[in-house]
Amino acid sequence: EICGPGIDIRNDYQQLKRLENCTVIEGYLHILLISKAEDYRSYRFPKLTVITEYLLLFRVAGLESLGDLFPNLTVIRGWKLFYNYALVIFEMTNLKDIGLYNLRNITRGAIRIEKNADLCYLSTVDWSLILDAVSNNYIVGNKPPKECGDLCPGTMEEKPMCEKTTINNEYNYRCWTTNRCQKMCPSTCGKRACTENNECCHPECLGSCSAPDNDTACVACRHYYYAGVCVPACPPNTYRFEGWRCVDRDFCANILSAESSDSEGFVIHDGECMQECPSGFIRNGSQSMYCIPCEGPCPKVCEEEKKTKTIDSVTSAQMLQGCTIFKGNLLINIRRGNNIASELENFMGLIEVVTGYVKIRHSHALVSLSFLKNLRLILGEEQLEGNYSFYVLDNQNLQQLWDWDHRNLTIKAGKMYFAFNPKLCVSEIYRMEEVTGTKGRQSKGDINTRNNGERASCESDVLHFTSTTTSKNRIIITWHRYRPPDYRDLISFTVYYKEAPFKNVTEYDGQDACGSNSWNMVDVDLPPNKDVEPGILLHGLKPWTQYAVYVKAVTLTMVENDHIRGAKSEILYIRTNASVPSIPLDVLSASNSSSQLIVKWNPPSLPNGNLSYYIVRWQRQPQDGYLYRHNYCSKDKIPIRKYADGTIDIEEVTENPKTEVCGGEKGPCCACPKTEAEKQAEKEEAEYRKVFENFLHNSIFVPRPE
């Protein structure tokens, strides 16, 4: 039986029963987050032979081997991968061996086996027999091989049963467990699979077969499966499906994905039955099963039944996710919300065209319209009374429309109307007239010069910084004293600052009027002495971190009918000084001879600067008598030393202890300092590890269903 579209077994080990009748999992298999150690011996799924996507195991307590669960798992196709991997075994606390003794082929993708503190029998598997390329495999932080004492079947009795291959210049026996060899086919079979009796399978078989040279006896197919036969390509009038089988048009026409709407089923494109048209193609009509190329970027047309879509919350904006053309009118009415600017950008940021009008009213939560970051055309096919196609009324905190230096917006038909936007400067509106091509369409009352910008410092002067001083967690800055025409109009200054790894921030980033603001704000009172330059000490900052800072003068906004001048600075980027790093992580030590200790650690999580060297101190301690109570020649009596759970394999260091020739004399001495390239590689490695772990957590931790 084919199971799918992906099976996620979590929290309760009894959910494994879902796999009972599966021969092929069309999709992925997740087994994860089972925190209570269980007895898995009664669970066995001999029918399962193929997983078409990937297998992921994560934090399953009590599971010691996969061999009993999946004794006949032969192929993992890797049609879709988990972060480039077809097999992921991560933080499996009790796993002692992989044990998938019938696994013969991972068609696409690599493997990642990491942070499994008890996992052995890794160096005894020759992954090159299973995967095409082993260079992308990532096997790190498992039980060190020296503590495993991996022995393949028969070696203790000096009657080895397994075959040997060479890995890293080491010719050795290959096995999955203490009693299961790794299967290898005779060299006469070449790339072909073979039966248990070493007879070569049909070339279209993959992994194994029940009878030689028979394309109906394959355990899995190299290419495609159709009507009980493995075929090199799908026959006429059938289509590739999920990367492994052939289906007919009726089948493809009749299935829906978990996410799709009723009408939008699968499509047939380039001989394949797929969920959606591929990138650069679009359905040839809403009910069509066929794809045609897009002209330019593919549009997603969204239509509102009631003609006007009201955006009054994040939920209503969510309906527009991915839309590039909106057929209808947009009425934006955002009075409140949490993190509203970035949420709106997430859901409405792709809209390029609105066919009707855009009306923004009572949106007190908005500071800017930059969340409509791709809007380039308002057609105005439908207009508000008075022939308005862009209408902005009573938005108490709206300060910016768009960044007109980086924005082309055309309003094809209709006029603009602006009223009661007290923080929106008229100059900003006039700029929009020029950019959108609406200049001359508006009549006198359409842009109200009295009640737009009445509470804003509109004509801005530039404040100049005069000095900056930094320490590890402080920045002191001063700036020129600003002198408006009437000194009494200057109330105070506000300093805005935030972490800015890159010099690309803008004043309105992530800002809305409901308190969501990526900038920290500090008010600075006027110095009592008119000749003293204003300044501030920003403290509690992170060492060796770049910050963006700018300052605004807070001024009285109206002197009778005149808008008074305000002032603000450019954005200044400034880095704090370096400081003492946090402690190194994951310190490990192991002896690789009678006179040497290898010590290994990870860099501190907060380097607080550029690390230049480490200091290592050690002292002698009394010998532990416990070590003498064991027979080290007996395989099963190796004492378990508790290692830091799932960190980094000591083997990485001990394989090639460096000895250098120093000062003309031969003899061992300190290893050469790491080259920049080595340091960079290690940094990238650490970063990659972090990125993968984040990806894993983000992928598998989901809200509990209602």
Partner: antibody, heavy 123, light 112 residues
């Protein structure tokens, strides 16, 4: 083209059994469930159950559970429906109809029907 | 079991005129994932049934656009905008959301 060809009409005595066959062609037999629907003379349609040809898994209407057995032979792409302990009210046309076999969501149920097999139960 | 009740049971119509058939389920046939498997089948005299509408409102391929379906929850309707002579037969609604799947008792459409 896609076809479901059913066996010929049957006349049975009360208490006997009948086995109706439905031979599929023009599509992959194992990609679809086979359903059985009956229609008594002048009456409406009644779903009896279905079978998954891949593993023989069945889903019966409780009304027929004790008397019906559905089977398939994948080598000949044929489905069978056996009804035991026949009564006179089992006189009906018995239809086979296919329905997509997919773990996900399907759009519709019975897109292809057989012509029907008339089973008459009479003493 | 879910009972599907159709009305009217008989529907005489003049060609070119519209027709409407109602189908009511004894309980909601919306599945937990939001899918509603409500279908309409037409059985022409002496033939096997044929699919017209699936999932409440979607026309099956080859079905003329004069046929349309609507409804939600427990109330559903099949409409024929302009009846033609070839539309005669018995129309059945069918729910495929809950086992056992059930048909309505049928509505016989005939030409006046």
């Amino acid at each position: 083209q896609v076809q479901l060809v059913q066996s010929g009409a049957e006349v049975k005595k009360p208490g006997a059994s009948v086995k109706v066959s439905c031979k599929a062609s023009g599509y992959t037999f194992t990609d679809y469930y086979m359903n059985w629907v009956r229609q008594a003379p002048g009456q409406g349609l009644e779903w009896m159950g279905n079978i998954n040809p891949n593993n023989g898994g069945t889903n019966y209407n409780q009304k027929f559970k004790d008397r019906v057995t559905m089977t398939t032979d994948t080598s000949t792409s044929t489905a069978y429906m056996e009804l035991r302990s026949l009564r006179s009210d089992d006189t009906a046309v018995y239809y086979c109809a296919r329905w997509i076999l997919y773990y996900g969501r399907s759009k519709w149920y019975f897109d292809v029907w057989g012509r029907g097999t008339l089973v008459t139960v009479s003493s | 079991d879910i009972v599907m009740t159709q009305s009217p049971l008989s529907l005489p119509v003049t060609p070119g005129e519209p027709a409407s058939i109602s189908c009511r389920s004894s309980q909601s046939i919306v599945q937990s994932n939001g899918d509603t498997y409500l279908e309409w089948y037409l059985q022409k005299p002496g033939q096997s049934p044929q699919l017209l509408i699936y999932r409440v409102s979607n026309r099956f391929s080859g079905v003329p656009d004069r046929f349309s379906g609507s409804g939600s929850g427990t109330d559903f309707t099949l409409k024929i905008s302009r009846v033609e002579a070839e539309d005669v037969g018995v129309y059945y609604c069918f729910q495929g959301s809950h086992v056992p799947y059930t048909f309505g008792q049928g509505t016989k459409l005939e030409i006046k």
